[in-house]
């Protein structure tokens, strides 16, 4: 009995420079090490304090990294993705997908639900508000009769 999980998905370009503690994060995923079911993408698993990513503050654990210096991370073996990061140089540009969970419920495996769907509360709240306004107006109208 899996409930529906809704996500607000945003993309961001993050430019980082390797400091003394490097970019300072770890990754999971790849075609040989799927982190999310039916998704071989590369995800941030850990951000190390004092690394460039932590000091910048925008990259978050759980973010999906879409590209590094313009190079797509689709369909890569895990170690190939790791090597691509390690060979990316001093200045590194990351295209990142943030997924903000906007509704909790009984959930199954992470990644279920429609990531591109409109969060259900964004529909229900206005509908509920409109219903209340209509009911109030109707009651006022009846009182005037």
């Amino acid at each position: 009995m899996n409930g529906r999980v809704d996500y607000l998905v945003t993309e961001e370009e993050i430019n980082l420079t390797r400091g003394p503690s490097g970019l300072g994060f770890n990754i999971v995923g790849g075609t040989d090490q799927q982190y999310v079911s039916n998704d071989s993408g590369i995800y941030v698993s850990r951000i190390k304090e004092n690394g460039a990513a932590a000091l910048d503050g925008r990259l978050q654990e759980g973010d999906k990294i879409l590209s590094v210096n313009g190079q797509d991370l689709k369909n890569l073996l895990h170690q190939d993705a790791v090597d691509l990061f390690r060979n990316a140089g001093y200045a590194v540009s990351l295209r990142v997908q943030h997924r903000l969970q906007v509704q909790n419920g009984p959930i199954g495996h992470r990644g279920e639900g429609d990531p591109s769907g409109i969060p259900i509360f964004m529909v229900l709240v206005p509908v509920f508000a409109l219903t209340m306004v209509a009911a109030w107006a109707f009651m006022r109208y009846r009182q005037q009769l």
């Epitope: 390797r18 503690s21 490097g22 994060f25 990754i27 170690q79 790791v82 060979n87």
Partner: nanobody, 125 residues
Framework: DVQLVESGGGLVQAGGSLRLSCVAS????????MGWFRQAPGKEREFVAA????????DYPDSVKGRFTISRDNAKNTVYLQMNGLKPEDTAVYYC???????????????????WGQGTQVTVS
């Protein structure tokens, strides 16, 4: 926390060999990439060798490539550094270090390692 203890250092003549060992405890050894660094008096800490969590990937600087070999035994929670053709300039304190697997930074970034041993002295005469 992970504890690292090095051993195997000593005094050796130029051209000789030594095998350093580093035993890890307190963590899941197979989840860590392992590295060796060295520091000579008055010099900065220098990357010597590294091996990934599975043993399938290694890296060395040009200064030791072909002379030093890093290996690991995950069953024994131990990483080794086989040093052949030793030179006087290899004299230093050798440190074992570990960092969580699948880090995105090159092995030579000392600041990316989470845990360090106390070091073992290697002197080449």
């Amino acid at each position: 926390d992970v504890q690292l203890v090095e051993s195997g250092g000593g005094l050796v003549q130029a051209g000789g060999s030594l095998r350093l060992s580093c035993v890890a405890s307190g963590g899941t050894f197979s989840s860590y990439d392992m590295g060796w660094f060295r520091q000579a008096p008055g010099k900065e800490r220098e990357f010597v060798a590294a091996i990934n969590w599975s043993g399938g990937s290694t890296d060395y600087p040009d200064s030791v490539k072909g002379r030093f070999t890093i290996s690991r035994d995950n069953a024994k929670n131990t990483v080794y550094l086989q040093m052949n053709g030793l030179k006087p300039e290899d004299t230093a304190v050798y440190y074992c270090a570990s960092r969580w697997r699948s880090g995105v930074d090159p092995y030579y970034y000392a600041g990316t390692y989470d845990y360090w041993g106390q070091g073992t002295q290697v002197t080449v005469s």
